[in-house]
């Protein structure tokens, strides 16, 4: 697995997407976990609804929310109010029994708000870094979903 970098700015929201083969992972719950070291387990942060058919419903643990579009094959994780300690190495996982398949390895990068509030004339937003070749960067700063909002309503 290559690592995908998602950059966000402190205090804002970051949306991480993990595409997958919807047929291959049919019926499987998904999870978002954090790798705290080079070795050791990936610590579960949040997982989708216990009932797979309700995976479109948003589940939340603190400032982290997860929802799964099982038909389109996209797992979406939203980190609200990004803080420096949210930065780290994460994985999107597909669960089956006690096993977990890695859907995507994700590096979340939290940058300090570059807008110096003492001099508001120098607005800067994250741009693609030129210093690395082996990582795909996505800048995905977005609002968090509202309470009760269903991001992927079931189709009739």
């Amino acid at each position: 697995h290559n690592t995908t970098v998602f950059q966000g700015v402190e205090g804002q929201s970051l949306q991480v997407s993990c595409p997958y083969d919807s047929m291959k992972h049919w019926g499987r719950r998904k999870a978002w976990c954090r790798q705290l070291g080079e070795k050791g387990p990936c610590q579960r942060v949040v997982s989708t609804h216990n009932l797979w058919l309700l995976s479109f419903l948003r589940r939340r643990n603190g400032s982290t929310a997860i929802t799964d579009d099982t038909l389109g094959g996209t797992l979406t994780i939203t980190l609200r109010n990004l803080q420096p300690h949210d930065a780290g190495f994460y994985q999107c996982q597909s669960l089956h029994g006690s096993e977990a398949d890695t859907l995507r390895k994700v590096l979340v990068e939290v940058l300090a708000d570059p807008l110096d509030h003492r001099d508001a004339g120098d607005l800067w937003v994250p741009g693609e870094s030129e210093s690395f070749e082996d990582a795909h960067v996505e800048h995905s700063i977005s609002r968090s979903l509202l309470e009760g909002e269903i991001p992927f309503p079931p189709t009739s």
Epitope: V5, Q7, E10, Q35, L36, G37, E38, Q83, P84, H85, A87, G88, F89, L107, E109, L111, A112, D113, P126, S129, E130, S131, F132, A135, V137
Partner: antibody, heavy 120, light 107 residues
């Protein structure tokens, strides 16, 4: 064993610039954030900023924006900090300090410091 | 910026005693606080992270507690090598900030 080797002391004139280096060993350079910290004589510690060597993404203390520039050279696994338009206020010891795995949950390893003296 | 008020600034104690150093944040920083030891001629040492997590290789006489705004570093049964400068640091939000330091001197 993890070590952070910093470049030696420098004496510079006001208005000049200086670039110091931090060469880590004992771990994978790109896996850990690198931070820079200032300590003026007899004073506390002041965080300047941090850089993610994997992406080159950096964050700065607003007090040092325009003063400090953080860079990395992945080919030599070395972190650099450049300070410009130096004044006597910039005379201090500057430390590099390694963060945690792709994050900054405390600075587990520190360099020995680089003493910068600004004097005419 | 989050201000960290460290107290006391100076502390004298004897080997074998137990001491506490306090660190108060100007706003809640949850558990995101670290404690460091600074000694002349040595590189700074991370003692505690996440408010209470002892780093590997650090003696168990060091302990940290607290969350939110009030934190404490406790050193029980002081050893001669413990007399040094101690700093707290928050990494809850940018810019990371340090306390003003506590100098622990031998009585």
């Amino acid at each position: 064993e993890v070590q952070l080797q910093q470049s030696g002391p420098v004496l510079v004139k006001p208005g000049a610039s200086v670039r110091m280096s931090c060469k880590p060993s004992g771990y994978t350079f790109t896996d850990y954030y690198m931070n820079w910290v200032k300590q003026s004589h007899g004073k506390s510690l002041e965080w300047i900023g941090s850089i993610n060597p994997y992406t080159g993404g950096s964050s700065y203390n607003q007090n040092f924006r325009g003063k400090a520039t953080l860079t990395v050279d992945k080919s030599s696994s070395t972190a650099y900090m450049e300070l410009n338009s130096l004044t006597s206020e910039d005379s201090a010891v500057y430390y590099c300090a390694r963060g945690s795995y792709y994050s900054n949950l405390g600075f587990a390893y520190w360099g020995q410091g680089t003493l910068v003296t600004v004097s005419a | 910026d989050v201000q960290l008020t460290q107290s006391p600034s100076f502390l004298t104690a004897s080997p074998g005693e137990t001491i506490t150093i306090n660190c108060r944040a100007s706003k809640s920083i949850s558990k995101y606080l670290a404690w460091y030891q600074e000694k002349p001629g040595k590189t700074n040492k991370l003692l505690i992270s996440s408010g209470s997590t002892l780093q590997s290789g650090i003696p168990s006489r060091f302990s940290g507690s607290g969350s939110g705004t009030d934190f404490t570093l406790t050193i029980s049964s002081l050893e001669p090598e413990d007399f040094a400068m101690y700093y707290c640091q928050q990494y809850s939000e940018y810019p990371f900030t340090f306390g003003s330091g506590t100098k622990l001197e031998i009585k």
